[in-house]
């Protein structure tokens, strides 16, 4: 008897590999036998010349060769893309609609994201080596290459994690050259060779020499600071420089900063910062108003240096980035004692000339302004009847002065004589801080 | 269309965890490899993590590596990222962007909000 | 890490009239293959950024005609050739040469 027609077998999705065609299977019942009808991205497909579809006996749908692809940039589509297939089957009592089967062709980019590097490894120790394969479709596998064959690896001593390969305990044999394979159904690429050197291990409690490098530091920039750090950002520099010497460089290189003393001076200590770069590098925290003195220290594993020369850079003073610290308002006999702490150090930015003292001015004090030179940090103003005196004070730099303390004021109730006289347990006068 | 919906966001402690989802549609989930961005309020965007399409590979920098985890479904066709031991200076919204091979973001998400304060 | 810088970091425009942005990295963003990928962004008030450029000088699509990209080597220009009301917002450029992937510090423009 008559029935509509029922999908038995969809299509499924496929990598189109070349050189013989694809093929998309879809089977159906239904009586009387259902038609086969195939689209392409929900279009019918036309199978006339030069279309490269064509249609089997059995519904069966052969791609001949792969259509015009998407662009990487239309929102649906990579370019790996080819689109997806369904197949319909109609009789006079209805049409089947099978699942969508996508296909696509296989694609393996050139661009490593991440090249293994040449580096220096101690006996005993682990080391990895890092691989980051190009893009593909299918996503490629990573294999390793020492020396120009496949790498033997070693349960319990190589291990590859996410392209990674990760040695355990480094042996001399492991000495070489290595290089990272992506390999998928498109092919493979093959990364840089990165030349592995292994050191014995050494007993000394001083880190070994690396003698045989030569470093030369030859540039300390002052960096722009960046806006997003905000109105005050600390400084930075640049530093960069040249590494000659053996075959496998060093593993990481250590700035070494200090602040330059008077000359005969005993020369600070020595602060040392791991950099992330291999010829140049980002070096933050570092002090406005400051001169310094830069090198850099190269190592791999327990072996270091030798040092660099030595490069000056005087960073430019800036205003005070805090405000001096408690702020106080006493009163004294026909005066008010202003005194205050200096900013904490690392806000200094520079060296501290003096300070700026404002009164806001109202009914008892006008608006004026002092200056203390120096390292003073008080100040005694006259007063001459009762009322709210308030102040605020800033630190000055040779770039002018700081971020103002939030105000102090103090209320004088009544006249000064008859408070010397009449002292009550709190005083006569309150001091609050706005 | 091309969608992306994050979620998962909201205010922890110093020190502790979250789990961010991306929610995608609109497109082969499964053939695009994605990434996490961060922008800090009135700061630059910052690059935090990608995955490859299988979600064999990923990738970090150095301020998140080892504490961050992305990581991707695609039967759920759904991204994540696994944030533990957060700081303070990783308050940010946090975005997920589609990538087109390893060459560029194409599409964003509305991004969710991260605010790691005590 | 590649720092990228970009200048100006605010620029005031006016409608109608030419604009351009510059990008400088500290190292060289072509790789070993002679491939460079350095795209631009444009991240309105309130919004998440929009692809603008891609390697270097490609438009995405949807993105007008009057925006382009240029440069080799380290250093890049977004030009927008007739500033529209729209086009404001801060601008970023993205590095994905090297890892870790590096955004500008941004340049905001805004109209006169």
């Known amino acids: 008897q008559d029935s509509p027609p029922q999908i038995l077998v969809h299509p499924q999705d496929q990598l189109f590999q070349g050189p013989g065609p694809a093929r998309m299977s879809c089977q159906a019942s239904g009586q009387p036998p259902p038609t086969i009808r195939w689209l392409l991205n929900g279009q019918p497909l036309s199978m006339v010349p030069p279309d490269p579809h064509h249609l089997l006996p059995d519904g069966t749908l052969l791609l001949l060769q792969p259509p015009a692809r998407g662009h990487a940039h239309d929102g649906q589509a990579l370019s790996t893309d080819l689109g997806v297939y369904t197949c319909e089957a109609s009789n006079r009592l209805g049409t089947a609609v099978s699942r969508g089967a996508r296909l696509s062709v296989a694609v393996l980019r050139e661009d490593f994201q991440i090249q293994p590097r040449d580096m220096v490894a101690v006996v005993g120790e682990q080391f990895t080596l890092e691989c980051g394969p190009p893009w593909g479709h299918p996503e490629p596998t990573v294999s390793w290459w020492k020396d120009g064959k496949p790498l033997a690896l070693q349960p319990g001593r190589h291990t590859v994690s996410g392209g990674s390969l990760l040695m355990a305990r480094a042996e001399k044999s492991d000495e070489g050259t290595y290089m990272c394979v992506a390999t998928n159904s498109a092919g493979h690429r093959e990364s840089r060779a990165a030349r592995v050197s292994i050191q014995e291990p050494q007993d000394y409690t001083e880190p070994v020499e690396l003698l045989a490098v030569r470093i030369q530091l030859e540039n300390v920039t002052l960096l722009n600071p960046d806006p997003a750090e905000g109105p005050k950002p600390r400084p930075a520099v640049w530093l960069s420089w040249k590494v000659s010497g053996p075959a496998a460089p060093a593993q990481s290189y250590t700035a070494l900063f200090r602040t330059q003393t008077a000359p005969g001076g005993q020369g600070a200590p020595w602060a040392e910062e791991l950099l992330a770069g291999w010829q140049s590098a980002e070096l933050g925290g570092l002090h406005w108003g400051q001169d310094y003195e830069f090198k850099v220290r190269p190592s791999s594993g327990r072996a270091r240096g030798p040092d660099s020369n030595v490069l000056l850079l005087r960073l430019p003073e800036k205003v005070p980035s805090a405000p001096p610290q408690e702020v106080t308002l006493k009163p004294g006999n026909g005066t008010v004692f202003v005194s205050w702490v200096p900013p904490p150090a690392e806000n200094h930015n520079g060296i501290i000339r003096g300070y700026q003292v404002w009164s806001l001015g109202n009914t008892s004090l006008p608006p004026a302004n002092w200056t203390v030179v120096g390292e003073q940090t008080q100040l005694e103003i006259a007063t001459h009847m009762p009322g709210s005196y308030c102040v605020q004070v800033a630190a000055v730099t040779g770039a002018g002065a700081g971020e103002p303390s939030r105000p102090v004021c103090l209320l004088l109730e009544q006249a000064m004589e008859r408070a010397t006289q009449e002292p009550s347990e709190h005083g006569p006068w309150t001091l609050e801080q706005l | 269309e091309v969608q992306l919906v994050e979620s998962g966001g909201g205010l922890v402690q110093p020190g502790g965890s979250l789990r961010l989802s991306c929610a995608a549609s609109g497109f082969t989930f499964s053939t695009y490899a994605m990434s996490w961005v961060r922008q800090a309020p009135g700061k630059r965007l910052e690059w935090v993590a990608t995955i490859s399409q299988g979600g064999t590979y990923t990738y970090y920098p150095d301020s998140v590596k080892g504490r961050f985890t992305i990581s991707r479904d695609n039967a759920k066709n759904t991204l994540y990222l696994q944030m533990n031991s957060l700081r303070a200076e990783d308050t940010a919204v946090y975005y997920c962007?589609?990538?087109?091979?390893?060459?560029?973001?194409?599409?964003w998400g509305q991004g969710t909000l991260v605010t790691v304060s005590s | 890490d590649i720092v990228m810088t970009q200048s100006p970091l605010s620029l005031p425009v006016t409608l109608g009239e030419p604009a351009s942005i510059s990008c400088r990295s500290s190292?060289?963003?072509?790789?070993?293959?002679?491939?460079?990928?350095l795209n631009w962004y444009l991240q309105k008030p309130g919004q998440s950024p929009q692809l603008l450029i891609y390697r270097v000088s490609n438009r995405f699509s949807g993105v007008p005609d009057r925006f382009s990209g240029s440069g080799s080597g380290t250093d890049f220009t977004l030009k927008i050739s007739r500033v529209e009301a729209e086009d404001v917002g801060v601008y970023y450029c993205l590095q994905v040469t090297h890892v870790p992937w590096t955004f500008g510090p941004g340049t905001k423009v805004d109209i006169k």
């Open positions: 190292q060289s963003l072509e790789n070993s293959n002679g491939n460079t990928y």
């Open positions: 962007a589609r990538l087109i091979y390893y060459d560029y973001l194409d599409y």
